[in-house]
Interface confidence: low
């Protein structure tokens, strides 16, 4: 159905990291434009990205209102220059997206090691609390604000002189690990939400090694 010069969108895909959420689809438009609508299961449809020739739409502003809700989007196709024209069924062609629950599905962004500090045979490693695009009370919330104790970090650490990795876990943003005196260590961290079934882990952070500028050392 539909007009002869429009085709329905397909391959609707959610791309989301730390709640920055974009809906992508195909095809690249030829003589047609798109409008996107988004809704929660129980809510009204809200239109976004009106009559666009893009094949993506940033829906972050909508999903951050309640990241635990489940959202559905749909992409309408209209003939270029004649957006009032509808399909044979009396409405424009459209395609539904898969459902998307930001809290359960947004990808965890690559974490960053903020600092490490050695005191004798102990090293305190601090993970930066990444900012999300969830905004409340005049500020953007951090990953920890949103996920609380659902979010843990895994630390991988090893002596600079060897490749044998050890691991530690924390449900805060700090690790306190034992190290051998006089040895330099390298560190990498990964964000994890163990309770998830998909997108459970982030990519590993960039490696930081002792003896470089990032750390702060107090030999006691």
């Amino acid at each position: 159905s539909g007009t002869t010069n429009t085709v329905a969108a397909y391959n609707l895909t959610w791309k989301s990291t730390n709640f920055k959420t974009i809906l992508e689809w195909e095809p690249k438009p030829v003589n047609q434009v798109y409008t996107v609508q988004i809704s929660t299961k129980s809510g009204d449809w809200k239109s976004k990205c009106f009559y666009t020739t893009d094949t993506e739409c940033d829906l972050t502003d909508e999903i951050v209102k309640d990241v635990k809700q489940t959202y559905l989007a749909r992409v309408f196709s209209y003939p270029a220059g004649n957006v009032e024209s509808t399909g044979s069924a009396g409405e424009p062609l459209y395609e539904n997206s898969p459902e998307f629950t930001p809290y359960l599905e947004t990808n965890l962004g690559q974490p960053t090691i903020q600092s490490f500090e050695q005191v004798g045979t102990k090293v305190n490693v601090t993970v930066e609390d990444e900012r999300t695009l969830v905004r409340r009370n005049n500020t953007f919330l951090s990953l920890r604000d949103v996920f609380g104790k659902d979010l843990i970090y895994t630390l991988y650490y090893w002596k600079s002189s060897s490749s044998g990795k050890k691991t530690a876990k924390t449900n805060t943003n700090e690790f306190l690990i034992d190290v051998d005196k006089g040895e330099n260590y390298c560190f990498s961290v990964q964000a994890v939400i163990p309770s998830r079934t998909v997108n459970r882990k982030s990519t590993d952070s960039p490696v930081e090694c002792m003896g470089q500028e990032k750390g702060e050392f107090r030999e006691i």
């Epitope: 129980s42 209102k65 309640d66 809700q69 609390d129 409340r136 009370n137 500020t139 604000d145 805060t172």
Partner: antibody, heavy 121, light 106 residues
């Protein structure tokens, strides 16, 4: 077990000052936003203000009724929250509660038992 | 600051009744409204956030609706343990509680 224990309440004259403390335990204090909420005798809850966590620079926000008179601060090394109250008025008489605040859904998820402040001549 | 007007201030109903509390904001607060239950000697408990989302573990007899400036909280099958004072709280711009509604059982 999360615990919040307020102290420092008492009787003070109008125009006077008082400093309330809240000792926190059972959680990583530095990661949480903390708030003060009060309840005047026979009245409802009133949000006083909050202080954000270390990651958000310990910034503060206040209700219009106390702005410029009250100051919230915290000492993460002591797991303590403070409320400095100056230029007190009779209408500031209330039980003051400290509460842990989860900002994403504005949930006060743990509360202290409260401390009574009476402003009277 | 945003003002929240909650009504009624008190309410008496029978077990099994459906009761409704309303909250009106002095300006548009989108759907950034919570409902808290406060029982004597305990800290207030979050029941509903973002107007209508039930907090984990809260019975489904509690519900909320609205957007913009007008909001409604409903208990559909009143139980004896629901005796409490209920507050709305806006969090669109800072935080403001409503005046509270004391719910009693007849």
């Amino acid at each position: 077990e999360v615990q919040l224990v307020e102290s420092g309440g008492g009787l003070v004259q109008p125009g006077g000052s008082l400093r309330l403390s809240c000792a926190a335990s059972g959680f990583t204090f530095t990661e949480y936003h903390m708030s003060w909420v009060r309840q005047a005798p026979g009245k409802g809850l009133e949000w006083v203000g909050f202080i954000r966590n270390r990651a958000q620079g310990y910034t503060t926000e206040y209700a219009a009724s106390v702005k410029g008179r009250f100051t919230i601060s915290r000492d993460d090394s002591k797991n303590s929250l403070y409320l400095q109250m100056n230029s007190l008025k009779t209408e500031d008489t209330a039980v003051y509660y400290c509460a842990r605040l989860t900002m994403v859904v504005a949930e006060f998820d743990y509360w202290g038992q409260g401390t009574l402040v009476t402003v009277s001549s | 600051d945003i003002q929240m007007t909650q009504s009624p201030s008190s309410l008496s109903a029978s077990v099994g009744d459906r009761v409704t509390i309303t909250c009106q904001a002095s300006q548009d607060i989108n759907k950034y409204l919570n409902w808290y239950q406060h029982k004597p000697g305990k800290g207030p408990k979050l029941l509903i956030y973002y107007t209508s989302t039930l907090q984990t573990g809260v019975p489904s007899r509690f519900s909320g609706s609205g957007s913009g400036t007008d909001f409604t909280f409903t208990v559909s099958n009143l139980q004896p343990e629901d005796i409490a004072t209920y507050y709305c709280l806006q969090y669109d711009n800072l935080l403001t509680f409503g005046q509270g509604t004391k719910l009693e059982i007849k």
